[in-house]
């Protein structure tokens, strides 16, 4: 989604004194070099003992508007035989990121910085066994 929208509810954009565009450079620069992204493994989500799927989270009023989020496939972990191990739990690893959210009904549009928790993958942990008293 675009970051600087115009709205029919906003002042006349034809007016010479109206600030039509606030240009913000939102390009993401890769300081580690161009080759780093090609090394990102995309098959861990299937090979992991706590496999996950990725979902395309869309929000037109957010920048970035598209964020890929992980969701654990199972509550339990997968053992070497490919069966679910009921002594081990699959848990989501979450990362806090900063996003820009469009303020509703503001003219010109303004954005606020918000924190967002995003699932980035899943890991396997031992189940908590509660002893009977």
């Amino acid at each position: 989604a675009a970051i600087i929208p115009q709205s029919s509810a906003c002042p006349n954009t034809e007016a010479k004194d109206f600030l039509q565009n606030v240009k913000v450079n939102l390009k993401v620069f890769n300081s580690l070099g161009a080759k780093v992204s090609s090394r990102r493994p995309s098959d861990y989500l299937n090979r992991s003992t706590s496999p996950w799927t990725l979902h395309r989270n869309e929000d037109p009023d957010r920048y970035p508007s598209v964020i890929w989020e992980a969701q654990c496939r199972h509550q339990r972990c997968v053992n070497a035989e490919g069966k679910l191990d009921h002594h081990m739990n699959s848990v989501l690893i979450q990362q806090e990121i900063l996003v820009l959210k469009r303020e509703p009904e503001s003219c010109p549009f303004t954005f606020r910085v918000e924190k967002m928790l995003v699932g980035v993958g899943c890991t396997c942990v031992a189940s908590i066994v509660r002893q009977a008293a």
Epitope: A2, S42, D43, E58, P60, P64
Partner: antibody
Framework: EVQLVQSGAEVKKPGASVKVSCKAS????????FHWVRQAPGQGLEWIGV????????AYNQNFRDRATLTADKSTSTAYMELSSLRSEDTAVYYC????????????WGQGTLVTVSS | NIVMTQSPATLSVSPGERATLSCKAS??????VGWFQQKPGQSPRLLIY???NRYTGVPARFSGSGSGTDFTLTISSLQPEDFAVYFC?????????FGQGTKLEIK
């Protein structure tokens, strides 16, 4: 120079499957989403789905969820779209297109692959 | 799903004249609209993104406007190579949808 080169035309029988490829060059393959769009003869464009080669994530148009499978091979910078249980209505030109996820638009398109479904 | 409706289906204009193509969304799509040109046997070519931004290398005679539900593509002075089919498309929310196209023909 960014290029998306698709595989050649296919003729299939109803009920069969087809797998169309789209080879990317001129940029880092894993940085952008690949979307697949089809165009039936003389018709408009219909969005099939998306794959992100960087993380393997996929999303589909509900109309294709049960029959379309999108995959990507990072070693060859190639995206694939497989459509199963073909019927005559699937006769169309299938396009791959690169989507700039942050900027939010389709910029480069493949040349298209004509898939004809006929008994 | 968001429906994109283009009008007219066919537009006959003489070279050198101005052409105005319309696209209406079934619900607000902010400015998340693109315009594509397609010639017979070719793939779509991006002209305008975010409703009014001209894509790299697109001639200045092409301009886009609108927000919310109503969008317009204007070609100020038609050149012979501009006669083609034009599609609008929304990427506000998936499934991304396209208009049925406007065929721009020589009068």
């Amino acid at each position: 120079e960014v290029q998306l080169v698709q595989s050649g035309a296919e003729v299939k029988k109803p009920g069969a499957s087809v797998k169309v490829s789209c080879k990317a060059s001129g940029y880092t393959f894993t940085d952008y989403e690949f979307h697949w769009v089809r165009q039936a003869p003389g018709q408009g464009l219909e969005w099939i789905g998306v794959i992100h080669p960087g993380n393997g994530g996929t999303a589909y148009n509900q109309n294709f969820r049960d029959r379309a499978t999108l995959t990507a091979d990072k070693s060859t910078s190639t995206a694939y779209m497989e459509l199963s249980s073909l019927r005559s209505e699937d006769t169309a030109v299938y396009y791959c297109t690169r989507f700039l996820t942050y900027e939010g638009y389709f910029d480069y398109w493949g040349q298209g692959t004509l898939v004809t479904v006929s008994s | 799903n968001i429906v994109m409706t283009q009008s007219p289906a066919t537009l006959s204009v003489s070279p050198g004249e101005r052409a105005t193509l319309s696209c209406k969304a079934s619900q607000s799509v902010s400015i998340d609209v693109g315009w594509f040109q397609q010639k017979p046997g070719q793939s779509p070519r991006l002209l305008i993104y975010h409703a009014s931004n001209r894509y790299t290398g697109v001639p200045a005679r092409f301009s886009g406007s609108g927000s919310g539900t109503d969008f317009t593509l204007t070609i100020s002075s038609l050149q012979p190579e501009d006669f083609a089919v034009y599609f609008c498309q929304q990427d506000y929310s998936s499934p991304y949808t396209f208009g049925q196209g406007t065929k721009l023909e020589i009068k």
